[in-house]
């Protein structure tokens, strides 16, 4: 059979070899398509309800007015020439329709290097058959489940018009310290093929950098956590990021129930404060950091330095 | 909403001649074949005309061939019915009808216009 | 020409009831078959096309089948709106034709 690729919308005319060029003719087209059960045959002096989508011209050839996905499939011609010498015609019939361009929609302007970023969805509206999308990067193809790029794709068609919507969004893992302009695109390649992709315009996100966390500092006053009974403990949690984060303290584990404040005052200390420590500094950009643990302990007269372990208590602190 | 809105139905006598026209709307008509069905009073429904979408060609049974012509005004979203020779057997009520190729059928229909034929 | 032979002409139901009306074709017209309802004084108002599929609106208990050149319309449970005449209708050749109509009368 020969292959004919036929514009969804366009007028398709098959020939039938072998038929006189004009009336009388003996010939009958067959057709065996989405729009029969088995096989449909016209005739020269057919003319009917099938006339809107397929009939047999003066000259033998059957003319299809608009073609659609339905008239995908065979189409076969006999024809018997004056002398009776027989010829027989023989199509197979593809159709396609090539959408719009496609456009990249819910851009991000701005990428986290590092972690995980929404680029864009590519949507192409309108092909047939469906055809694929894919994405690149400064021009060059991005593999899905490569290098932190994954891609998640949704096919849906249209109920009245049988054509398809592609969409195709893309989460890329920007490298620290790469390309502070990456240009994305995205094309839409034809599923029947000798037909180019089609190209959307590109997007050039900004990357940013996040400044990397230095550590919590927490000070203790006295060096090394030890003190009498009845003396006085200062913790200082030094954050040197900015904007200041807040700061909240945790003692054995558990947050103080204390407003947020960067120094705590332990005075006249009793065996209740007696613990572990740390500060835990919470940045809008970034979520919690905890500091390291210090642990508060009471010399009994005649001890020197601090004691190991330490006893829980209920007290809470003060804070400047 | 599809609307279709027969007229021009009346009395005529035997051998005289009638115009139906029906009036469409709430659709692109000339995407649409048309056609005419009739129903005499108390009977089945018979198929009269049909028309393509452009108004090339027209397509009746023999019961109404070279007497009856269907035509369409693309431009006014019309179609028409024109009827001579009438006979007592073309009494009934004219129906206008979206479709008549294979890809509807019929899908719409209008209210109908009576025609009667009588001396 | 091709015949489309409708049967029973009438039939006496009641509400709840199924209801079956059959139309044969004298030859193949394939998929395209209409089926039709009219009530008296009122257009035909199109309830299955291409043989099986249900038109826009219309309820979901009337459906269509086909077996060859039969044609089958079934209302699943004959609600009393459904007391009307229902028509066939063959698009595949011409002349098209009808159906002589089934009237659904309540018994």
């Known amino acids: 059979a020969q292959n004919i690729t036929a514009r969804i919308g366009e007028p398709l005319v098959l020939k039938c070899k072998g038929a006189p060029k004009k009336p009388p003719q003996r010939l009958e087209w067959k057709l065996n398509t989405g729009r029969t059960e088995a096989w449909k045959v016209l005739s020269p002096q057919g003319g009917g309800p099938w006339d809107s989508v397929a009939r047999v011209l003066p000259n033998g050839s059957l003319f299809l007015p608009a073609v659609g996905i339905q008239d995908e499939g065979i189409f076969r011609c006999q024809a018997m020439n004056r002398n009776g010498k027989e010829t027989k015609s023989n199509y197979r019939v593809r159709v396609y329709q090539i959408p719009g361009k496609p456009e990249i929609v819910d851009s991000a302007s701005e990428l986290t290097a590092g972690v995980p970023n929404k680029v864009g969805t590519c949507v192409s509206e309108g092909s047939y058959p469906a055809g694929t999308l894919s994405w690149h990067l400064d021009g060059k193809p991005l593999v899905p489940n490569e290098k932190g790029v994954s891609v998640k794709e949704q096919t849906r068609r249209h109920p009245e018009t049988g054509l398809f919507t592609l969409q195709s969004e893309l989460m890329v893992t920007p490298a620290r310290g790469g390309d502070p302009r990456p240009t994305f695109s995205c094309s839409f390649s034809p599923g029947l093929p000798r037909h180019r992709a089609l190209r959307t315009a590109p997007i050039q996100p900004r990357v940013w950098e996040p400044v990397p966390l230095e550590e919590v500092q927490l000070v203790v006053e006295p060096e090394g956590g030890a003190v009498a009974p009845g003396g006085t403990v200062t913790l200082t949690c030094e954050v040197p990021a900015q904007p200041s984060p807040q700061i909240h303290w945790m003692k054995d584990g558990v947050p103080l129930p204390l407003p947020p404040s960067p120094v705590l005052i332990l005075p006249e200390i009793g065996p209740q404060d007696q613990g572990t420590y740390s500060c835990v500094a919470t940045h809008s950009s970034h979520g919690p950091q905890e500091s390291r643990a210090v642990s508060i302990s009471i010399i009994e007269p005649g001890e020197e330095g601090p004691t190991a372990g330490s006893v829980g208590g209920s007290g809470l602190g003060t804070l400047a | 909403e599809v609307q279709l809105v027969e007229s021009g139905g009346g009395l005529v006598q035997p051998g005289g001649s009638l115009r139906l026209s029906c009036a469409a709307s709430?659709?692109?008509?000339?995407?649409?074949?048309m056609t005419w069905v009739r129903q005499a009073p108390g009977k089945g429904l018979e198929w009269v005309a049909s028309?393509?979408?452009?108004?090339?060609?027209?397509y009746y049974p023999d019961s109404v061939k070279d007497r009856f012509t269907i035509s369409r005004d693309n431009a006014k979203n019309s179609l028409y019915l024109q009827m001579n020779s009438l006979r007592a057997e073309d009494t009934a009520v004219y129906y206008c009808?979206?479709?008549?190729?294979?890809?509807?059928?019929?899908?719409?229909w209008g209210q109908g216009t009576l025609v009667t034929v009588s001396s | 020409d091709i015949q489309m032979t409708q049967s029973p002409s009438s039939l006496s139901a009641s509400v709840g009831d199924r209801v079956t009306i059959t139309c044969r074709a004298s030859?193949?017209?394939?998929?395209?078959v209409n089926w039709f309802q009219q009530k008296p004084g009122k257009a035909p108002r199109r309830l299955i096309y291409?043989?099986?599929n249900l038109a826009d609106g219309v309820p979901s208990r009337f459906s269509g089948s086909r077996s060859g050149t039969d044609f089958t319309l079934t209302i699943s449970s004959l609600q009393p709106e459904d007391f009307a005449t229902y028509y066939c209708?063959?698009?595949?050749?011409?002349?098209?034709?009808f159906g002589g109509g089934t009237k659904v009368e309540i018994k």
């Open positions: 009808a979206r479709g008549g190729d294979i890809t509807t059928g019929f899908d719409y």
């Open positions: 709430g659709f692109t008509f000339n995407n649409y074949w």
């Open positions: 028309i393509d979408n452009s108004g090339d060609n027209t």
């Open positions: 030859q193949d017209v394939g998929i395209y």
């Open positions: 291409r043989a099986t």
């Open positions: 209708l063959q698009y595949d050749a011409h002349p098209l034709t």
